[in-house]
Interface confidence: medium
């Protein structure tokens, strides 16, 4: 990268993204790395990380989750169905990643990097998918009202929401990573 061309640290224009399976694999690991930093700050700030899974399950968040029918698990694996699920799930996570943007103090930059890296990952995966018609994009109006609702919660709920988003996103990406390695 020539001196002075490192603005905002988005990849320099000459670097064409490599869209091989390895590239996608590395992109996911990069995002997971960012998530672990955000989780570190969240866990240091609140005791959410110690809360039992059962207690945290009692929430009204509709976070994307892998199910048997999605074809991403070893039993009943279906490449096309699974890829559609991964892309759809990532698109659904975008509103939650937007919510995370104002939730961090020392890791503000990391939150941004996770959000931007996820957008890039979606692009990589869309190039890989053959059946783009099956991918449903979330409704912007619904997303906007969901964002407003999340931001209006009290401090404790916002802390819990942040923790849940990070945990669910991490689990979703880990499942996606395992599935993509079979493709």
């Amino acid at each position: 990268v020539p001196p002075g061309e490192d603005s905002k640290d988005v990849a320099a224009p000459h670097r064409q993204p490599l869209t091989s399976s390895e590239r996608i694999d590395k992109q996911i690991r990069y995002i997971l790395d960012g998530i672990s930093a955000l989780r570190k700050e969240t866990c240091n700030k609140s005791n959410m990380c110690e809360s039992s899974k059962e207690a945290l399950a009692e929430n009204n968040l509709n976070l994307p989750k892998m199910a048997e029918k999605d074809g991403c698990f070893q039993s009943g694996f279906n490449e096309e169905t699974c890829l559609v699920k991964i892309i759809t799930g990532l698109l659904e996570f975008e509103v939650y990643l937007e919510y995370l943007q104002n939730r961090f103090e020392s890791s503000e930059e990391q939150a941004r990097a996770v959000q931007m890296s996820t957008k890039v990952l979606i692009q990589f995966l869309q190039k890989k998918a053959k059946n783009l018609d099956a991918i449903t994009t979330p409704d912007p109006t619904t997303n906007a009202s969901l964002l407003t609702k999340l931001q209006a919660q009290n401090q404790w709920l916002q802390d819990m929401t942040t923790h849940l988003i990070l945990r669910s996103f991490k689990e979703f990406l880990q499942s996606s990573l395992r599935a993509l390695r079979q493709m």
Partner: antibody, heavy 123, light 104 residues
């Protein structure tokens, strides 16, 4: 302008310790994976250790595992290499390099290198 | 661990020649390979990343190819300033590793 400046090298006796530092500027340090590479006199390049951007996950060459520790301080834009139980075969120029950077993961190619700091292990 | 075997270890060529350096990986590394040039007394410089992508500012006479286990760096039309040692690096899986170098 991207700059990587290593310091902390010097002459040390076998079994001794040194801490190398690499001051980074001209880019958002916290977004980049960083790596130490070394080069023994008249020899080739040897990958020593890498550290992830955010989580601080690390990896080491077998030759330094258990003796060297890579770390970073994103607030200070600084990369470190703590070298303990030094051996004569650790004598080399140590380079700090930037890799796998920015929001788009492209490759681990090391696009910027510091000038290097000399470490000499001798009695 | 992945080993990289670089050949030849040294080579002599004339100005204008087409020069080929190869790097063989002990297992598949996809296209996760980069090439570096190190001139005497200087720090290494990235030439090629992702096996075949030319880094900005690197002359077009340099090119990289290959995937899996076999990779090639080609200099078409050797120039005096290309006198250097060339290294390949696999960054597919930790521990990363360099080839032993080719002195030109």
């Amino acid at each position: 302008q991207v700059q990587l400046v290593e310091s902390g090298g010097g002459l040390v006796q076998p079994g001794g310790s040194l801490r190398l530092s690499c001051a980074a500027s001209g880019f958002t340090f916290s977004n980049y994976y960083m790596t130490w590479v070394r080069q023994a006199p008249g020899k080739g390049l040897e990958w020593v250790s890498s550290i992830y951007s955010f989580s601080g996950d690390t990896a080491y060459a077998d030759s330094v595992k258990g003796r060297f520790t890579i770390s970073r301080d994103n607030a200070k834009n600084t990369l470190y290499l703590q070298m303990n139980s030094l051996k004569s075969e650790d004598t080399a120029v140590y380079y700090c390099t930037r890799n796998l950077g920015g929001v788009v993961v492209t490759t681990n190619g090391y696009d910027y290198w510091g000038q290097g700091t000399q470490v000499t292990v001798s009695s | 661990d992945i080993q990289l075997t670089q050949s030849p270890s040294s080579l002599s060529a004339s100005l204008g020649d087409r020069v080929t350096i190869t790097c063989q990986a002990s297992q598949s590394i996809s296209t996760e390979l980069s090439w570096y040039q190190q001139k005497p007394g200087q720090t290494p410089k990235l030439l090629i990343y992702g096996a075949s992508r030319l880094q900005t500012g690197v002359p077009a006479r340099f090119s990289g190819s290959g995937s899996g286990t076999s990779f090639t760096l080609t200099i078409s039309g050797l120039e005096a300033e290309d006198l250097a040692t060339y290294y390949c690096l696999q960054d597919y899986s930790w521990p990363y590793s360099f080839g032993s170098g080719t002195r030109l």
